[in-house]
Amino acid sequence: MMTGTIETTGNISAEKGGSIILQCHLSSTTAQVTQVNWEQQDQLLAICNADLGWHISPSFKDRVAPGPGLGLTLQSLTVNDTGEYFCIYHTYPDGTYTGRIFLEVLESSVAEHGARFQIP
């Protein structure tokens, strides 16, 4: 039975040209995390495998950095980065858990600074 829950940063905003940390946390389960996939809509951004380390999609390697932890740092943000991001946790023995984050990249300098994991 899957008892775990994914906590995410929820809806976050950042300024164009800036950086943001996407972070998820799996709680309420003793399941072992074997791999975390980061996806933007249906496009793979990165994989963090417990045994093999990180795979950053070549299309994003110049502006995606692994970490902190199982999170992902997006750099040089553009308005086109606005949208849904998903963290997909592969666990043993529970199976797969998915978390959702909505990122809004703002043109102006009035981006909210309330996001818990946001880089100032």
């Epitope: 074997t34 994989i47 495998n49 417990a50 380390g53 999609s57 070549p58 299309s59 110049d62």
Partner: antibody
């Protein structure tokens, strides 16, 4: 066109080391991880390890961890695999292979380098 | 280590035949499975990754299916250039491991 061109065949004595090179072209070398895989005569393929050419960070198969070192030279877009303390069982064809877009599989392979270990 | 088995180990078939190769894995690897084709004296060539996604330039007669621990590579209509050895590989953990191969030869 993606190309991985490996160094030539090697004959080594037991206990020696061998260093195989793999020159990449046709793509941005630092954007794609590189794997090394070997195949002994008549045997299945055996994964040895992988490296991120950008950071130089590597991961190894525990079986080879004490004997294998994978490195890169970013300037020449070349990956290297060095295997030490050679024994006859290391006689195999050694391949470099570029990691794919969407995970830890390999989408392009070098032509292979035959390493023969014999006294 | 994740163990990979393939069946059959070899098969004889004719041009135009439908060929199915199976790969069984010792633990759940979700859909993280690749298939490669290798001809004698040549390097492996990627056919399928993520269990069912066809690699660039691979003919549509090849298809992959399965998830979890059981996977299949199907060649819908065997062509002369398809006579080769086929390997499955999981791409999910360290070490990455390959199946023993299935040799497809001419009947």
């Amino acid at each position: 066109e993606v190309q991985l061109v490996q160094s030539g065949a090697e004959v080594k004595k037991p206990g020696a080391s061998v260093k195989v090179s793999c020159k990449a072209s046709g793509y941005t070398f630092t954007n794609y991880y590189m794997h090394w895989v070997r195949q002994a005569p008549g045997q299945r393929l055996e994964w040895m390890g992988r490296i991120d050419p950008d950071s130089g960070g590597s991961k190894y198969n525990e079986k080879f961890k004490s004997r294998v070192t994978i490195t890169v030279d970013k300037l020449s877009s070349t990956a290297y695999m060095e295997l030490s303390s050679l024994r006859s069982e290391d006689t195999a064809v050694y391949y470099c292979a570029r990691e794919g877009h969407y995970g830890f599989y390999s989408d392009y392979w070098g032509q292979g380098t035959t390493v023969t270990v014999s006294s | 280590d994740i163990q990979m088995t393939q069946s059959p180990s070899s098969l004889s078939a004719s041009v135009g035949d439908r060929v199915t190769i199976t790969c069984r894995v010792s633990e759940n690897i979700y859909s993280y499975l690749a298939w490669y084709q290798q001809k004698p004296g040549k390097s492996p060539k990627l056919l399928v990754y993520n269990a069912k996604t066809l690699a660039e330039g691979v003919p549509s007669r090849f298809s992959g299916s399965g998830s979890g621990t059981d996977f299949t590579l199907t060649i819908s209509s065997l062509q002369p250039e398809d006579f080769a050895t086929y390997y499955c590989q999981h791409h999910y953990g360290n070490p990455l491991t390959f199946g023993p191969g299935t040799k497809v030869d001419i009947k």
